[in-house]
């Protein structure tokens, strides 16, 4: 009788071990479809988004005729500052008329009042020629009021409604600038 | 992951130019923007040109009037000339690819293996 009881337990045993195991492989693969749905869902919203997004400018970017703007949450130093920008896809703020001075001043008294912002100008060390990123001369309006004095490389900045000039190794806001996408319809 | 094979370094006179190209395979979808750096000897690695997947260009100060970026999307490739070449310009030259991230200022930064340009009579 105690063998068979004993038997009997052993058979339970096994069962139990069994059922363990498997239980253990469907929370396994219950896991796994998890988080393949997870990636699935995660697929489809950025297809659907990037389908649906015509939107000109991109969240949090604020559109002007044809381009878009980003003004930053945080300071770097003028390199810093245009490698940010390229990496979003755009360049140091560029800006080639009063309208759009006007439109930029404007919008930062909005955003957040009067800070300095980087912009993508700079002073040749050698001729001390003031040129755009791209290589283009600011419209004569546009050339920052002599301000600094620096024997480093100087770059320009928008500060409350003027264009004025820094050591490029100081800390600044700064402001981005892209091409608006054309709507495809 | 992107792939980027440079080529066109070598000897050059000074006054005279070169044209640097880099293509990029791989996630080549997914680049903002493309350019050149260059890092000569006992110095920091510095931006030389670049432009943005929307066309955008860039120049350090050192190539302005003298450097040309241009990109060729269908062949996912990015060009360099300069002319006027100086002593000054003698560096290696490093292809750079930067590319999108859900991250704002997240992209990653691919870089070539770089090729030697060397400005001397």
């Known amino acids: 009788k105690l063998l068979q009881v004993s038997t009997i337990a052993m058979q339970q045993q096994e069962k139990l071990i069994q059922q363990e195991r498997a239980l253990l492989n469907f929370t396994e693969w219950k896991r796994s479809c998890a988080l393949q749905m997870k990636y699935c869902q995660a697929f489809m919203q950025n297809s659907l988004s990037s389908a649906h997004n015509s939107s000109p400018c991109p969240n949090n970017w604020i559109q002007n005729r044809e381009s878009c703007y980003y003004v930053s949450e945080i300071w770097s130093i003028w390199h810093t500052s245009q490698e940010n920008c390229l990496k979003e896809g755009s360049t140091l703020l560029q800006i080639e008329s009063k309208e759009e001075m006007d439109f930029i001043t404007g919008s930062l008294r909005k955003i957040k009042g009067s800070y300095d912002y980087w912009v993508g100008l700079s002073q040749d060390g050698h001729s001390g020629r003031w040129l755009w990123q791209d290589g283009s001369s600011p419209s004569p309006g546009l050339l920052p009021a002599e301000r600094s004095q620096s024997a480093n490389q100087v770059c320009g900045y928008v500060k409350s409604n003027s264009l004025l000039s820094s050591n490029c190794s100081t800390w600044k806001y700064f402001i981005c600038e892209k091409y608006a996408l054309r709507s495809s319809v | 992951q992107v792939q980027l094979v440079e080529s066109g370094g070598g000897l050059v006179q000074p006054g005279g130019s070169l044209r640097l190209s880099c293509a990029a395979s791989?996630?080549?979808?997914?680049?903002?923007?493309m350019g050149w750096y260059r890092q000569a000897p006992g110095k920091e690695r510095e931006l030389v040109a670049a432009?943005?997947?929307?066309?955008?260009?860039v120049y350090s100060d050192s190539v302005k009037g003298r450097g040309t970026i241009s990109r060729d999307n269908a062949k996912n490739t990015v060009y360099l000339q300069i002319a006027s070449l100086k002593p000054e310009d003698t560096a290696v030259y490093y292809c750079?690819?930067?590319?999108?991230?859900?991250?704002?200022?997240?992209?990653?930064?691919?870089w070539g293996k770089g090729t030697q340009v060397t400005v001397s009579s």
């Open positions: 791989g996630s080549s979808d997914s680049i903002n923007a």
């Open positions: 432009i943005t997947s929307g066309g955008r260009v």
């Open positions: 750079n690819v930067k590319t999108k991230s859900a991250v704002l200022f997240g992209g990653m930064d691919y």
